[in-house]
């Protein structure tokens, strides 16, 4: 807190300019009018204030707007945004995507801070849903943003927004998140033809059910092993050897290298060894010939 002192003669700030970098904290407090600061916030970012000086400017704005800053000020906060606490940001009502972009730009290249997380939360809640433009903006700044949301939060993402998602945006998503996103992606891309559809849906397939994988196997998609390894184990297990062969196409040879890893390992254990042998890859661990396989899950369903 800066002590209250009168502004020295001749030092009253008539505008926000670089001469203020020479002011002490107490002089900024005494000589810079908060209303002037608010109307000329766009200049602050161009002036090389120290963090100590920015503390004083923030304090002046806090006094002027105890209920939270108006968006006209928020949009021009620039580096002063880094001085804001999540508590400060919770008082804001940010509705403009331009304001959001301006503040994200300040934090660019850094991890998502608690301030940024709070800002995004306030913005998305204010909009009611994660629309395409917002998602586009957020994933541009934070590729991992989508995967930081809970399945419940992801449920508010409209299918139309899925068009903004890039494969790298899903890199850190877990199966629960992909379970939510996959049906939205399927809906979003439903009018595309086979090969184009597969390119778009590929990164979401970690949430795909067995029946959709079976359908894809009929379309000569040639899924790569990296995508196959990310599929849900429970969705892969019911696939036949023939279906997997069709699904992977020329990439089927890669199964040998992955035979000890899920979901390949578990899938091999469910296949007849005879069928595995038809692949000519030397996959071992299938069900020996003459053994009867009971599908207990089907039995439970019938009972």
């Amino acid at each position: 807190e800066v002590e209250k002192t009168a502004c020295p003669s001749g030092k009253k700030a008539r505008e926000i300019d670089e001469s203020l970098i020479f002011y002490k904290k107490w002089e900024l407090e005494a000589c810079v009018d908060a209303a002037l600061l608010a109307t000329q916030m766009d200049r602050v970012n161009a002036i090389p204030f120290t963090y100590e000086q920015l503390d004083v400017l923030k304090h002046k704005l806090d006094e002027l707007y105890p209920q939270g800053y108006p968006e006209s000020v928020i949009q021009h906060l620039g580096y002063l945004f880094l001085k804001m606490s999540p508590e400060d940001i919770r008082k804001w009502n940010v509705t403009s995507l331009e304001t959001l972009k301006a503040l994200l730009e300040v934090n660019k290249g850094h991890e998502m801070s608690p301030q940024v997380a709070t800002l995004i939360d306030r913005f998305v809640k204010g909009r009611g849903q994660l629309d395409k433009d917002t998602l586009d903006t957020l994933t541009a700044f934070y590729p991992g943003y989508l995967c930081s949301l809970s399945p419940e939060e992801l449920s508010s993402v409209p299918p139309s927004s899925i068009w903004a998602v890039r494969p790298q945006d899903l890199d850190t998503c877990d199966p629960r998140q992909l379970d939510v996103l996959y049906p939205k992606a399927r809906l979003a891309f439903q009018n595309m033809n086979g090969s184009e559809y597969f390119v778009k849906i590929q990164s979401f397939l970690g949430g795909a059910p067995t029946e959709d994988l079976k359908a894809l196997s009929q379309q000569n998609v040639s899924m790569d092993l990296a995508t196959f390894m990310k599929l849900r184990t429970d969705a892969v297990l019911p696939l036949t050897v023939a279906e997997v062969q069709k699904l992977l196409g020329p990439h089927v040879e890669g199964l040998k290298a992955e035979e000890r890893h899920r979901p390949v390992r578990d899938w091999i254990l469910r296949q007849r060894q005879d069928d595995l042998d038809t692949l000519g890859l030397g996959l071992q661990g299938g069900i020996p010939n003459g053994y009867l396989v009971l599908d207990l899950s089907m039995q439970e369903a019938l009972s």
């Epitope: 002590e3 020295p8 670089e18 001469s19 970098i21 020479f22 002490k24 904290k25 107490w26 002089e27 090389p48 120290t50 100590e52």
Partner: antibody, heavy 121, light 107 residues
Framework: QVQLQESGPGLVKPSETLSLTCTVS??????????WGWIRQPPGKCLEWIGN???????NYNPSLKSRVTISVDTSKNQFSLKLSSVTAADTAVYYC?????????????WGQGTMVTVSS | DIVMTQSPSSLSASVGDRVTITCRAS??????LAWYQQKPGKVPKLLIY???TLQSGVPSRFSGSGSGTDFTLTISSLQPEDFATYYC?????????FGCGTKVEIK
């Protein structure tokens, strides 16, 4: 480490302009962490602050000298300069350039060795 | 302008003595005060800033105190290399101003 070196004529005629340059070595004048200043000390008298400059060119002068002083910076040469116009014998002094860390309670932490300037015809 | 007044203007002391120099500001300057040491023909050297913060590399026998208008520089045990002139300077507001010095001489 950072060193400062003043240079310029040791003798200036009354009513002329005193010009001095301070060369910064061992560090960049373009650091956002410092102001660069000029201070003088007339023989047997007190130290007097002349003014400060930031690498961007923004400057701040002692009001008692403001009408006669110009401090400028040349980042490409890592130098800053002092010009004092209309000099009189009262401007005879040792002139120091110094570094001033940017902080609320700042102080001149590195000084040049000083250069004696005599104003005489 | 803020006027800085040092006292005494000179003093004589012996090696090992405790020496105290005072500086008074014409108005309150909080703790915006620095102390410098200058030996004959040499450059001023920063000892203390913010009234009591020791500059890096300065021996711990030097200490500063005070706030507002009255400040003190203390040398707890005077060493031969400490014989010099000491200046205070306020950085509370521009124009920065210096005291006219206290000369510490050998008794």
């Amino acid at each position: 480490q950072v060193q400062l070196q003043e240079s310029g004529p040791g003798l200036v005629k009354p009513s002329e302009t005193l010009s001095l340059t301070c060369t910064v070595s061992g560090g960049s004048i373009s650091s956002s962490s410092y102001f660069w200043g000029w201070i003088r000390q007339p023989p047997g008298k007190c130290l007097e602050w002349i003014g400060n400059i930031y690498y961007s060119g923004s400057s701040n002068y002692n009001p008692s000298l403001k009408s006669r002083v110009t401090i400028s910076v040349d980042t490409s040469k890592n130098q800053f300069s002092l010009k004092l116009s209309s000099v009189t014998a009262a401007d005879t002094a040792v002139y120091y350039c110094a570094r001033l860390p940017r902080g609320d309670r700042d102080a001149f932490d590195i000084w040049g060795q000083g250069t004696m300037v005599t104003v005489s015809s | 302008d803020i006027v800085m007044t040092q006292s005494p203007s000179s003093l004589s002391a012996s090696v090992g003595d405790r020496v105290t120099i005072t500086c008074r500001a014409s108005q309150g300057i909080s703790n915006y005060l620095a102390w410098y040491q200058q030996k004959p023909g040499k450059v001023p050297k920063l000892l203390i800033y913010a009234a009591s913060t020791l500059q890096s590399g300065v021996p711990s026998r030097f200490s500063g105190s005070g706030s507002g208008t009255d400040f003190t520089l203390t040398i707890s045990s005077l060493q031969p290399e400490d014989f010099a002139t000491y200046y205070c300077q306020q950085s509370y507001s521009t124009p920065f101003t210096f005291g006219c010095g206290t000369k510490v001489e050998i008794k």
